[in-house]
């Protein structure tokens, strides 16, 4: 049994972080695998997570973590019985990806005026939770074609947009994903889509 | 609310024994490492110990070495300290503390007077 | 004498910015993030900052530390007289497995 593709992780900073790799033929990973991590810190000890398949011969583990500051560094063994496979390390501040937001929701009341809110996805005491950046994805179920990503580059979890840019009378999805600049992370998983329809008045025509 | 509540100190002789323990309470206490840290009259702080959460490994200050032992029993999430051989040297309020990459929470201490 | 050097004492008037100096000696191993406890008369230390620069949740953010190689500081900003206490550094030294606190700095709020 060996490693064919060496475990690459990614934090969320704040509880988990997820490993993946890939072994070099077919593998029940929760039985055949463990993964132990440790804070390289005096007084941590080893935890051990049990891996679940990712498609034939990959396997991913999602690691426990109690919180995350920029100087924490963890080894990581991966075990197969009684033999190490492999043997690593792994930087959270250096591999971040964060969580997605939630709960974005569309509102339609305001005149002519469409406001997305979503939610951060992490605490007020978590350092990302003021250096969010957001990307809104706009997208037509009719046309393919009509397809936008606006950038939200302040802090505020909303988006203002007038109702006039989309077109009237049809429906749309937005979804929105997250970055932060301060740590070079990845961008996050989408979140879920919400759908509304679009209908606003049309300006009298002037001739 | 993490709670540590020292107990067991008092006056010795010279060459005595003590056991101090601290109950935790508000929190895990299995899933952290724990630590004593003394301060003596008028003094500044001084770390004397730590254990793992399991216990498996252990820390002494080179002034304690030989005759304090750390310990925990995670099932009466209690941390104890056995004192033997003491000094003079050893008076002091000893606070009970829990790590979590510092020591993020302490009790209120206990006094341990050495003197004949 | 203690790994960790403070200044014995510090001092400022309310509103003032002070900062705390804890410097290793030559020979400390640069490893380790450094921790900043408070301690207040009478009452058991707290901790104020850990991991250089982090802060737990309640302490205000006048409150701000910094590292650099194998020394580090404590700023306080908008001095207030609740903060006269003393100041204690510290950091775990993997060399020897054990942990280091600074001798400690009395603040005192003037006027």
């Known amino acids: 049994m060996k490693v064919l593709q060496e475990p690459t992780c990614v934090s969320d900073y704040m509880s988990i972080s997820t490993c993946e790799w890939k072994m070099n033929g077919p593998t029940n990973c929760s039985t055949e695998l463990r993964l132990l991590y440790q804070l390289v810190f005096l007084l941590s000890e080893a935890h051990t997570c049990i891996p679940e398949n990712n498609g034939g011969a990959g396997c991913v583990c999602h690691l426990l973590m109690d919180d995350v500051v920029s100087a924490d560094n963890y080894t990581l063994d991966l075990w197969a019985g009684q033999q190490l496979l492999w043997k690593g390390s792994f930087k959270p501040s250096e591999h971040v990806k964060p969580r997605a937001p939630g709960n974005l929701t569309v509102h339609t009341n305001v005149s002519d005026t469409l406001l997305l809110t979503w939610s951060n996805p992490y605490p007020p005491d978590n350092y990302l939770y003021n250096h969010l950046t957001y990307a809104v994805n706009i997208w037509s179920e009719n046309d393919p074609a009509d397809f936008r990503i606006y950038n939200v580059t302040y802090l505020e979890p909303s988006l203002r947009i007038a109702a006039s840019t989309l077109k009237s009378g049809i429906s749309y999805r937005a979804r929105v994903r997250a970055w932060a600049q301060c740590y070079n992370t990845t961008w996050s998983e989408w979140s879920p889509s919400t759908k509304w329809h679009n209908s606003y008045r049309e300006p009298f025509e002037q001739h | 609310e993490v709670q540590l509540l020292e107990s067991g100190g008092g006056l010795v002789q010279p060459g005595g024994s003590l056991r101090l323990s601290c109950a935790a309470s508000?929190?895990?206490?299995?899933?952290?490492?724990m630590a004593w840290v003394r301060q003596a009259p008028g003094k500044g702080l001084e770390w004397v110990s730590a254990i793992t959460m399991s216990g498996r490994s252990i820390y002494y200050a080179d002034s304690v070495k030989g005759r304090f032992t750390i310990s925990r029993d995670n099932s009466k999430n209690t941390l104890y300290l056995q004192m033997n051989s003491l000094r003079a040297e050893d008076t002091a309020v000893y606070y009970c503390?829990?790590?979590?990459?510092?020591?993020?929470?302490w009790g209120q201490g206990t006094l341990v007077t050495v003197s004949s | 004498q203690s790994v960790l050097t403070q200044p014995p004492s510090a001092s400022g008037t309310p509103g003032q910015r002070v900062t705390i100096s804890c410097s290793g000696s030559?020979?400390?191993?640069?490893?380790?993030?450094f921790n900043w406890y408070q301690q207040l008369p009478g009452t058991a230390p707290k901790l104020l900052i850990y991991a250089d620069s982090h802060r737990p949740s309640g302490v205000p953010d006048r409150f701000s530390g910094s590292k650099s190689g194998t020394s580090a500081s404590l700023a306080i900003s908008g001095l207030r007289s609740e903060d006269e206490a003393d100041y204690y550094c510290g950091t775990w030294d993997y060399s020897l497995n054990r942990y280091v606190l600074g001798g400690g700095t009395k603040l005192t709020v003037l006027g």
């Open positions: 503390a829990r790590v979590h990459r510092a020591f993020d929470y």
């Open positions: 030559p020979l400390f191993p640069d490893s380790g993030s």
């Open positions: 508000g929190f895990t206490f299995s899933r952290h490492a």
